[in-house]
Amino acid sequence: QGQDRHMIRMRQLIDIVDQLKNYVNDLVPEFLPAPEDVETNCEWSAFSCFQKAQLKSANTGNNERIINVSIKKLKRKPPSTNAGRRQKHRLTCPSCDSYEKKPPKEFLERFKSLLQKMIHQHLSSRTHGSEDS
């Protein structure tokens, strides 16, 4: 049940990431740690790296408010889960600083990719027989 709630939150975050992708030109063009090809059991660790990253509005134009609201939603911490707690204790997961830094557009694309991976794993874990490759 708790894990389900988290994955539902991940699905909502995908929509927020997609909204922010429409405003990449209004974000500070800063390079941010962007995990990619995250190893199994390090997903929650990578997720927290995305949440900690200093994604910021460039404070230009009329989109500042909607951007700041979206960033705030992205950073809202999900309640702790057993899976999350287990992963926190994995010392083998890379530190946030060790991940390649990318500009906002690629950062958001990689964040979305991780969210999708986590949802797909969750969906597959509840199912037998439809996974092909």
Epitope: I8, T127, S130
Partner: antibody, heavy 117, light 107 residues
Framework: QVQLQESGPGLVKPSETLSLTCTVS????????WGWIRQPPGKGLEWIGY???????NYNPSLKSRVTISVDTSRNQFSLKLSSVTAADTAVYYC???????????WGQGTLVTVSS | DIQLTQSPSSVSASVGDRVTITCRAS??????LAWYQHKPGKAPKLLIY???SLQSGVPSRFSGSGSGTDFTLTISSLQPEDFATYYC?????????FGGGTKVEIK
Amino acid sequence: QVQLQESGPGLVKPSETLSLTCTVSGGSISSDYWGWIRQPPGKGLEWIGYISSSGSTNYNPSLKSRVTISVDTSRNQFSLKLSSVTAADTAVYYCARSAGVADFDAWGQGTLVTVSS
Amino acid sequence: DIQLTQSPSSVSASVGDRVTITCRASQGISSWLAWYQHKPGKAPKLLIYVASSLQSGVPSRFSGSGSGTDFTLTISSLQPEDFATYYCQQASSFPLTFGGGTKVEIK
């Protein structure tokens, strides 16, 4: 705004292979999941399967032995192949994008494929 | 496979009416339910995902609720462009499955 367009023959003979292509415009196929759904005349929607941008697939077990979905990132297209078709495979076939992995947020208009000799 | 049963199969309503469509799952699916609007010859349109989240660009007169096995799509004030067939879809496990559809017709 991403748009999807199905293409392929509207008539396929029984026992042959149905082949459809979906062309994606206004966005890149190199992220998200890309799926096929069909609707037989007068019936409901049936999920056939989907493929991720990295090439991993999930298929409906009821069709799995006959289905192949593939992606061509260079052409921004993905394809459906359904082998050994019968009249029961006559349907409107839709291609769709799943950004959220489990629901479909962009669809093509559909293409009717009739299986008949 | 998870079966989804929609009711009613069709409903006649007038512009301005409140319309409620229900979808029942054969087993618990938490909030993993989506709703679509489909008009003949057009591409289906995602309205609601994870039971109650409104898809970007969808008018606020559409709302979704429910969890577990029982879900509802509500159109608070029916507009002329809302006459269509509505489908629910479970997103809890593979194979992804759809309800049989509810046709909203003009009274």
